[in-house]
């Protein structure tokens, strides 16, 4: 989490700041959504538990050609300790349930806001 600021960052980003920025990006996506997000692409639903950042990235990384979520994908990679590539799946996916990206983002946003309020940043 200390590297989330990337090269342009003046220093390490506190975990709470990184989570706030991710939340703000998801808010931005949901508020600026005019046409169906990512053309209505479907992704695997995930269990919003420990390890969900990697699981969320594993789901969203399979959506290609959707500029609206590229920043989210990059931000999630900062929360996931291992490299994630398309086609990779963790046990946290609800493998029999696919939902639209818009719903996925909404569910993730709600959960992350509560984690922020409860001070759970890792």
């Amino acid at each position: 989490l200390t590297c989330l600021g990337g090269f342009a960052s003046p220093g390490p980003v506190p975990p709470s700041t990184a989570l706030r920025e991710l939340i703000e990006e998801l808010v931005n996506i949901t508020q600026n959504q005019k046409a169906p997000l990512c053309n209505g692409s479907m992704v695997w639903s995930i269990n919003l538990t420990a390890g969900m950042y990697c699981a969320a990235l594993e789901s969203l990384i399979n959506v290609s050609g959707c500029s609206a979520i590229e920043k989210t994908q990059r931000m999630l990679s900062g929360f996931c300790p291992h490299k994630v590539s398309a086609g990779q799946f963790s046990s946290l996916h609800v493998r029999d349930t696919k939902i639209e990206v818009a719903q996925f983002v909404k569910d993730l946003l709600l959960h992350l806001k509560k984690l922020f309020r409860e001070g759970q940043f890792n």
């Epitope: 506190p14 709470s16 706030r20 709600l110 509560k114 922020f116 309020r117 001070g119 940043f121």
Partner: antibody, heavy 120, light 112 residues
């Protein structure tokens, strides 16, 4: 329109139990936190408990642990507070309140309250 | 548990007066996310409380500009710049940073 309506209060004997309800409308309870706050006659406000109906994450004031049980029914968009082993000092107006839905920074809506009177 | 101590517990004032209510927490109420969840609520007899100020100094929508909040760390203040007839009520501070959340004992503002 957002509304919280409490019910279930009334007169109960010492040692008795009561289940208070809080019916929510105008929003989905899973999108926020719901709290119970009580106020004894002529006294101040007391925070009792909080629930996240999305995952049943519950927090109590230790003073009420074992005395109060908070729960939610998402299908009915309703909250409950089960009060056991009631004593005279539990006589109070019980309010449910919700955390606002953006960052959960404060209580933006409250119910009208329901009065619980513990007396023989 | 964090104790929230309000003072005074009651005060008498006239319409137009500047009123200051203080609230002191027994320890810092800065949350681990960096926010300070200090709120002020107004309550009138037989009614539910109403939010005035959140996160120390932010006025809730629809709250008149005569209400303001300030402070940091453990010391907080609610100021009513020019008391109006509808402001006679009881005021509570509240900390929502650390569980169990706690209210101050209240300050009753009465007509002089």
């Amino acid at each position: 329109e957002v509304q919280l309506v409490e019910s279930g209060g009334g007169l109960v004997q010492p040692g008795g139990s009561l289940r208070l309800s809080c019916a929510a409308s105008g929003f989905n309870i899973k999108d926020t936190y719901i709290h119970w706050v009580r106020q004894a006659p002529g006294k101040g406000l007391e925070w009792v408990a909080r629930i996240d109906p999305a995952n049943d994450n519950i927090k109590y004031d230790p003073k009420f642990q074992g005395k109060a049980t908070i729960s939610a029914d998402n299908a009915k968009n309703s909250l409950y507070l089960q009060m056991n082993s009631l004593r005279a000092e539990d006589t109070a107006v019980y309010y449910c309140a919700r955390s606002e839905e953006n960052w959960y920074d404060f209580f933006d809506y409250w119910g009208q309250g329901t009065l619980v009177t513990v007396s023989s | 548990d964090i104790q929230m101590t309000q003072s005074p517990s009651s005060l008498s004032a006239s319409v137009g007066d500047r009123v200051t209510i203080t609230c002191r927490s027994s320890q810092s109420i800065v949350h681990s996310n960096g926010n300070t969840y200090l709120e002020w609520y107004q309550q009138k007899p037989g009614k539910a409380p109403k939010l005035l100020i959140y996160k120390v100094s932010n006025r809730f929508s629809g709250v008149p500009s005569r209400f303001s909040g300030s402070g940091s760390g453990t010391d907080f203040t609610l100021t009513i710049s020019s008391l109006q007839p509808e402001d006679f009520a009881t005021y509570y501070c509240f900390q929502g940073s650390h569980i169990p959340y706690t209210f101050g004992g209240g300050t009753k503002v009465e007509i002089k």
